[in-house]
Interface confidence: low
Amino acid sequence: AIVFIKQPSSQDALQGRRALLRCEVEAPGLVHVYWLLDGAPVQDTERRFTQGSSLSFAAVDRLQDSGTFQCVARDDVTGEEARSANASFNIKWIEAGPVVLKHPASEAEIQPQTQVTLRCHIDGHPRPTYQWFRDGTPLSDGQSNNTVSSKERNLTLRPAGPEHSGLYSCCAHNAFGQACSSQNFTLSIADESFARVVLAPQDVIVARNEEAMFHCQFSAQPPPNLQWLFEDETPITNRSRPPHLRRATVFANGSLLLTQVRPRNAGVYRCIGQGQRGPPVILEATLHLAEIEDMPLFEPRVFTAGSEERVTCLPPKGLPEPSVWWEHAGVRLPTHGRVYQKGHELVLASIAESDAGVYTCHAANLAGQRRQDVNITVATVPTWLKKPQDSQLEEGKPGYLHCLTQATPKPTVVWYRNQMLISEDSRFEVFKNGTLRINNVEVYDGTWYRCVSSTPAGSIEAQARVQVLEKLKFTPPPQPQQCMEFDKEATVPCSATGREKPTIKWERADGSSLPEWVTDNAGTLHFARVTRDDAGNYTCIASNGPQGQIRAHVQLTVAVFITFKVEPERTTVYQGHTALLQCEAQGDPKPLIQWKGKDRILDPTKLGPRMHIFQNGSLVIHDVAPEDSGRYTCIAGNSCNIKHTEAPLYVVDKPVPEESEGPGSPPPYKMIQT
C-alpha cells in the first residue's frame, strides 16, 4: 500500500519569493509521483518544478499559482494510486497603479463647489490600507472639508474648491509591503479671486524717437491690481515716473505707452497682476531699439557674355532683420526674368554686354536704410590696335616690341620668348599698354617673341621675330698692358665681331711699321724673338664696311722673367737660436721679395724685434720658439710676373748629451748653429 509520510499543506506565500510544497511517500514497489493544479497535471518550468517528490517554486506568481495543488503517487506495477490532501497558497502581494478621476467623468466637468472623487489604483492582498497626499503632504480624515476613507481607495472632496488644487498622490501598504501611485493627478480648480491673464504684453522693436505700446490685462473677482515695472524694478505710474521714463503713460485698461523712445528706455518691462487671493502673476516684454549697421563694400565684378552669374548681397546686421532688394538704373529688379533677384542674390542669366553698369543692393528696417553699389563689367575679347612686328634691334641699345590691344576690362598682356614666359627683371619690362622693352639688347635676344592679350572673355596672340644688329666690338677686348719675355717667342691676340666679319690689323702707336721679325697673322701679333726694342705702344684696328673701325691700344713691356738665384732650404733650428732662410731672385724689372709665414704675409714694417728681412731678400728669425715652426714662402714679383718657392722651418729642443756619444758628435739632422 502507498502511504504519505509528508503531505502538502496550505501556507502563506509572498509574490515573487521562493516556496515549497512537501510530499513524501512510502510503498513496496517503484512509485511515480506527480502534481495536479486544479485537477490538471503540473508541467515543470524554470520557475516551478518537482524536486524529488516535492514541488518547488523559485518565484511564486499570484496568477499562475492560485488554485488547489495535490500530490499524486502511483505504483506503476500494481496500478495503485493515492492522492494527498489539497493544499493552496495564500499569496500576499501589492502592485502600484495611477491616481484617476472617478467623479465627475472628465476634468472639463470639474467646477468650483462640485464633488470630486479620486481613486487610487493600488491593488494587493491582503487588502491594503491607503494614504492620500496633496503636493506631498499627507491628508487625514475630515481635513479641510475632505472626506477620506482609509479603508477605501477613494478620496472624496466635498465640495471641491480652489484650495483643493494641487498634485494628488497615494500610497498603500499591506503585509507584503508598500507601493505608491505610478501616475499622479493634478487637480486645478480656478479661483475667481486669483488674477488671470487676459492679454499679455509682446516684445516690441521701435525706431529712436518713435513710440512704443505694451498691452496688459488681467481679470479676477473682485478686479485685480495691475502694476508696471522697468528693469531695475522701478514702478511706473502716471503720478511717479522714474527720470528716464518721463514720457511713459499707463492707461486705465493697463496699456503702457512710451513716447520719443531713447536708447536708455530699451530693456525689460514687467506687468504684474495681483488678485484678492493667490500669487502675483508677472508678465515680461522687452523693448528693443531698432538698429541697422553699414553694409560691406562690393568688389567690382567682371563677367563674360553668355554666362550665368550671381552676386550675393549680405544684409547688414540689424534689428529687426533688414529686408533686402536690388535696383538697377533706379528700378527695382523683378523676381523672375533674365536679370532678377532671388533671395539676397542678384542673378544675371545669359549675360549680355548691355548688362554692364552699376547695380545697387538696398537694405532697410525701422532704423533706416543702407545701400551699396557693385560695378559690373561685361568682358569682351581683346582686339588689335598694334600687333608685334618683326624687328631689327641694335645690340647694346634698348629695343621695343608693341602689343597694343583694347577690350573690357583692360586686357592683361604677357610675353613669351622662345615659348618661355617672360618674367619682368632688370632687362625686360612690360609697360601698362603691353609694350615690351628689352634693356641693353644682347646678341642672344635674336629669337621669336609672342604676346598674349587676355580678358575673362578670351585671348588673342601674335608673334614677331627679332634680329639683333650686332655692334662692331673686340671679342674679347685686348688687355691694355701686357708683358713679353725677353729673347723668347710671344704672341698678342686680337679678335672682333660685327654685322660683317671685320678685318683686323696691328700697327705701332707712333705709326711706324712693324719690324720684319714681327708678323700680323689674322689679328695675332707674333714676335719670333722678343728684343728690347719691341717694347712700346701698339694699336689693334678692327674694321668693316658698314660699321667703320674700332681701335684697342696695348702697351707691351719686355721683361726678363723672374728666376731664383738662391732658394730657402728645409731648416731645423734649436729653440732660442737664430734661423736664416735665404732667398734671392733676379729679373727685369728687378723683382721685390715678400715672405709669407704660416699663411700670412710678413709685413716688414710690423715684424717686431725678432724678425728681419735683408736687402737681398733673406729672412732672419732670432730667438726662435716652437710656434715659429711651419712653412715659409718666398714670393718674388715685378710688373710682369710673380714666382714663389717655399721651405719648412722646424724648431726643436736642444738634446742633453748622453755618455755614449763622444764629444763633438754631429746631431742627427742638419742644423744651423749660432
Epitope: 568688389e299 565684378r301 592683361t412 598674349v452 587676355s454 580678358t455 575673362p456
Partner: nanobody, 124 residues
Framework: QVQLQESGGGLVQPGGSLTLACAAS????????MRWVRQAPGKGLEGVSS????????YYADFAKGRFTISRDNAKNTLYLQLNSLKTEDTAMYYC?????????????????VGQGTQVTVSS
C-alpha cells in the same frame, strides 16, 4: 620673391586621373586667391579653376566642371588640382598662378607670375 613650382604632370590614358600640386613661396600664400591656367599646344592660355584665400569658394571653367577639383593646404603653402575623366583635349601645359587678395573669381586671365608649368599628356 614670388616662386611657384608645379609638379604631378605626366602621360595618362583617356579616362585616367592625375593630381597636380603647386608649392608656393615668397608671399603670404594664405592671404591670396590662387588659380590654375593651362596652355594647349599652339593655343593661348585659358583659365581652368580658381580658389579663394580661405578655400571656401571655388570656380571652374565649363570644361572643368564635374571633372576637375581645386583645393589648397594653407599650412603647407600648396595648391592642388585633381584631374579626373581626362580627355585628349586636356593635353596642355598646366600652370599655377597667384591671384589677388580679394575675389578668386573675377580677376583677368592669365595672372602673373606663374611657375614653369607641368605637362599633362592624355593619349591612348
Amino acid at each position: 620673391q614670388v616662386q611657384l613650382q608645379e609638379s604631378g604632370g605626366g602621360l595618362v590614358q583617356p579616362g585616367g586621373s592625375l593630381t597636380l600640386a603647386c608649392a608656393a613661396s615668397g608671399f603670404a600664400f594664405s592671404s591670396y586667391a590662387m588659380r590654375w591656367v593651362r596652355q594647349a599646344p599652339g593655343k593661348g592660355l585659358e583659365g581652368v579653376s580658381s580658389i579663394s584665400a580661405g578655400g571656401d569658394e571655388t570656380y571652374y571653367a565649363d570644361f572643368a566642371k564635374g571633372r576637375f577639383t581645386i583645393s589648397r593646404d594653407n599650412a603647407k603653402n600648396t595648391l592642388y588640382l585633381q584631374l579626373n575623366s581626362l580627355k585628349t583635349e586636356d593635353t596642355a601645359m598646366y600652370y599655377c598662378a597667384k591671384g589677388d587678395r580679394n575675389s578668386p573669381r573675377y580677376s583677368s586671365w592669365p595672372i602673373t607670375p606663374v611657375g614653369q608649368g607641368t605637362q599633362v599628356t592624355v593619349s591612348s
